[in-house]
Interface confidence: low
């Protein structure tokens, strides 16, 4: 008789999750000399320890502290790029502009990017069938708590000018319920961060509106200003040209607005 198993509303743990985390760790530490000291087996053990045998609706930030400690990493605090609802372009940008970093360019962000995971209370099994959905089941699930924890730490580390890439094609360009809006914005440190600069990425080729005047951007400006951080905003009308000009800034076509 098969054992009864909790059915959650979200997709189950990503196939080959342990192997993927371990492999990503090995890959990352090979590519990044400053992280060569990291023992990937210990990282996996700490990752596993955060959610295995625990109820997947009762995960806390404390559960992830051993992993956070092992994954401690110093990135240049003035080279941080946050993003909301436009991950692919943000990652394309940091692949070209190699001295800037998204959360997923750090070890812990890289390990977990696009993965899902959860366990079961009182068993050492990983649940590959289903995991809790943030809305339909519970917010204190292993994936959500992980991203809340690493996002908070990433924002806390930022200094000087912090950039954020926002999706101008969304109805809410700035969404208070996104990780950026609910976690990162509130954990930027006013004593370290001088300015938050938003880059609003346009979707339509003929879209010449000033999306920096959008009501949700004004809302973001208000939240940031109240935290004694300056705010600035730029329209990126042509993201394709934007990336091209990051690659080749001396190109004559890159002197015009992008």
């Amino acid at each position: 008789v098969p054992r009864w198993r909790q059915q959650w509303s979200g997709p189950g743990t990503t196939k080959r999750f342990p192997e993927t985390v371990l492999a990503r760790c090995v890959k990352y530490t090979e590519i990044h000399p400053e992280m060569r000291h990291v023992d990937c087996q210990s990282v996996w053990d700490a990752f596993k320890g955060a959610f295995i045998s625990k109820h997947p609706c009762n995960i806390t930030e404390e559960d992830y502290q051993p992993l956070m400690k092992l994954g401690t990493q110093t990135v240049p605090c003035n080279k941080i790029l946050l993003w909301s609802r436009i991950k692919d372009l943000a990652h394309q940008f940091t692949q070209v502009q190699r001295d800037m970093f998204t959360l997923e360019d750090t070890l812990l962000g890289y390990l977990a990017d696009d993965l899902t995971w959860c366990g079961e209370f009182n068993t050492s099994k990983i649940n590959y069938q289903s995991c809790p959905d943030w809305r339909k089941d519970c917010s204190n699930n292993p994936v959500s708590v992980f991203w809340k924890t690493v996002s908070r730490r990433f924002a806390e580390a930022a200094c000087d000018v912090v950039h954020v890439m926002l999706n101008g094609s969304r109805s809410k360009i700035f969404d208070k319920n996104s990780t950026f809006g609910s976690v990162e914005v509130h954990n930027l440190q006013p004593e370290k961060v001088q300015t938050l600069e938003a880059w609003v990425i346009h979707g339509g080729r003929e879209d010449s509106r000033d999306l920096c005047q959008d009501p949700t951007i004004k809302e973001l400006e208000s939240i940031i200003s109240k935290r004694n951080i300056q705010f600035s905003c730029k329209n990126i009308y042509r993201p394709d040209k934007f990336l091209q000009c990051v690659k080749n800034p001396e190109d004559s076509s890159c002197t015009s607005e992008i």
Epitope: R24, K27, E30, I31
Partner: antibody
């Protein structure tokens, strides 16, 4: 002990085809990216192609694109190279080589090599 | 014409130190790790150095690798007769999306 054993080489006429195989043992085959590297008689090493651990990504040197196809069967622990429209300049010893864990491109190196199989293209 | 450039030959007397250079560009050596291989006559290549300077187990510490900018080098100290072989540098090339080798350097013992 890691072992890579190539087979399938031989004499073939220009325009002909060959399929090389590389039987792997002594390690978890589907944890590693794999490559083919060739060496023309009296010449240096030339990387030909590689394939990621799960077969999802393949890459080729420009000179064989559209002509060679790399593949793998993880259930059989075997790597393949299908070579079509062969030319005299494809004459070489073909080595199967194990890459680094899960095909790390930036740190990609060849930790273990087979003994090679000779492909001769001549009329 | 190889993407990475090595001198075709190098030589030394037993006990001497020999250095082999490998020159590339920002898309290969500049951005990625360098490996070195030894190929004894009639045999398959063998990994000597990976990740610029790491030695696999079993490789004597007489062999050392280093990298600076877009160039790398392999040093063999305390040269021995069994070191007579061809040596190849290799890196990944981001713009080509593939591995590239140097043309090889034949080391001869005088």
């Amino acid at each position: 002990e890691v072992q890579l054993l190539e087979s399938g080489g031989g004499l073939v006429q220009p325009g002909g085809s060959l399929r090389l195989s590389c039987a792997a043992s002594g390690f978890t085959f589907d944890d590693y990216g794999m490559s083919w590297v060739r060496q023309a008689p009296g010449k240096g090493l030339e990387w030909v192609s590689d394939i990621s651990w799960n077969g999802g990504k393949t890459h080729y040197v420009d000179s064989v694109k559209g002509q060679f196809t790399i593949s793998r069967d993880n259930s059989k622990n075997t790597l393949y190279l299908q070579m079509n429209s062969l030319r005299a300049e494809d004459t070489a010893v073909y080595y199967c080589a194990r890459g680094s864990l899960f095909h790390d491109s930036s740190g990609f190196y060849f930790g273990h090599w087979g003994q090679g199989t000779l492909v001769t293209v001549s009329s | 014409q190889s993407v990475l450039t090595q001198p075709p030959s190098a030589s030394g007397t037993p006990g001497q130190r020999v250095t082999i250079s490998c020159s590339g560009s920002s898309s290969n050596i500049g951005d990625n790790y360098v490996s070195w291989y030894q190929q004894l006559p009639g045999t398959a290549p063998k990994l000597l150095i990976y990740r610029d300077s790491q030695r696999p187990s079993g490789v004597p510490d007489r062999f050392s690798g280093s990298k600076s900018g877009t160039s790398a080098s392999l040093a063999i100290s305390g040269l021995r007769s069994e070191d007579e072989a061809d040596y190849y540098c290799q890196s990944y090339d981001s713009s080509l999306s593939g591995s590239v080798f140097g043309g090889g350097t034949k080391v001869e013992i005088k």
